[in-house]
């Protein structure tokens, strides 16, 4: 019984952690695997959580590093 209780408490704790923490509702993190090699010039805009439009996901990654910010992607396409 005690083991089951601990398991249930752990499960609840995990659920609360993985629940809607605010960051998820704001947007998702930009995928930054290409940024080290330089960003493509292809215009595929994303809307940042700062309300600014970035020409592509890589550029948002670039700007987060360069400006030491943590801007997420609010949506695909321009703001």
């Amino acid at each position: 019984m005690k083991v089951t209780g601990i398991f249930l408490l752990s499960a609840l704790a995990l659920l609360s952690l993985s629940g809607n923490t605010g960051a998820d509702s704001l947007g998702r993190e930009a995928k930054c695997y290409n940024e080290l090699n330089g960003c493509t010039k292809i215009y595929d805009p994303v809307c940042g959580t700062d309300g600014n439009t970035y020409p592509n996901e890589c550029v948002l990654c670039f700007e987060n590093r360069k400006r030491q910010t943590s801007i997420l992607i609010q949506k695909s396409g321009p703001c």
């Epitope: 080290l36 330089g38 960003c39 600014n52 439009t53 670039f62 590093r65 360069k66």
Partner: antibody
Framework: QSVKESEGGLFKPTDTLTLTCTVS????????ISWVRQAPGNGLEWIGR???????DYASWARSRSTITRDTNLNTVTLQMTSLTAADTATYFC?????????????WGPGTLVTVSS | AYDMTQTPASVSAAVGGTVTIKCQAS??????LSWLQQKPGQPPKLLIY???TLASGVPSRFKGSGSGTEFTLTISGVQCDDAATYYC????????????FGGGTEVVVK
């Protein structure tokens, strides 16, 4: 593609400097533009930048008296610097930041000379 | 604060010789470093980006190397046209920096 600064000129101490960088052949919505200056006989000094999204950043020494804005329709970026002193005498450059080059400044304007003297 | 220290301030080389310029970052900047060449009365010109990639039209006698905090620009087979001032520039961050450029190195060709 090109970037070019507006004419500088002679200013008095305490004046406000306004310079415009006009770009052609590319969109300000896809590139960052930086302002850099060079005092006579001295090295390059970064002033600040406006990125593709319109966010601005400034060198620590310039933050309190500099403002960078842009007009994506007119293809212009403007630098405004208040409370000029003789130490602001320099050639001012605007430069295009290349995201595909890891942020290097791949294109520079010819520069414009600003003299501050009473 | 990502300060860039460039050495030497000035260097003299004979035509055909080799010039080595060093640039040190106060903190790691990975390979986000570029080298610029400036001649009197002209704007700077991009030579090398990402520490070692030659910009378009730049002769192969220019070579950039390094990563982290230590970087080098080497000019092999120096020509008269290489007489200029060279600057390193960190492209890693502009957050809370005073300057992104090194102090410059004047190359005199004899």
């Amino acid at each position: 593609q090109s970037v070019k600064e507006s004419e500088g000129g002679l200013f008095k101490p305490t004046d406000t400097l306004t310079l415009t960088c006009t770009v052609s052949g590319f969109s300000l919505s896809s590139y960052a533009i930086s302002w850099v200056r060079q005092a006579p006989g001295n090295g390059l000094e970064w002033i600040g930048r406006i990125n593709s999204g319109g966010a601005t950043d400034y060198a620590s020494w310039a933050r309190s008296r500099s403002t960078i804005t842009r007009d994506t329709n007119l293809n212009t970026v403007t630098l405004q610097m208040t409370s000029l002193t003789a130490a602001d005498t320099a050639t001012y450059f605007c430069a295009k930041e290349e995201y595909s080059y890891g942020g290097a400044y791949g294109m520079w304007g010819p520069g414009t000379l600003v003299t501050v003297s009473s | 604060a990502y300060d860039m220290t460039q050495t030497p301030a000035s260097v003299s080389a004979a035509v055909g010789g080799t010039v080595t310029i060093k640039c040190q970052a106060s903190e790691s900047i990975s390979t986000y470093l570029s080298w610029l060449q400036q001649k009197p009365g002209q704007p700077p010109k991009l030579l090398i980006y990402k520490a070692s990639t030659l910009a378009s039209g730049v002769p192969s006698r220019f070579k950039g190397s390094g990563s982290g905090t230590e970087f080098t620009l080497t000019i092999s087979g120096v020509q008269c046209d290489d007489a200029a001032t060279y600057y390193c520039q960190q492209d890693y961050t502009i957050s809370n920096v005073g300057n992104v450029f090194g102090g410059g190195t004047e190359v005199v060709v004899k």
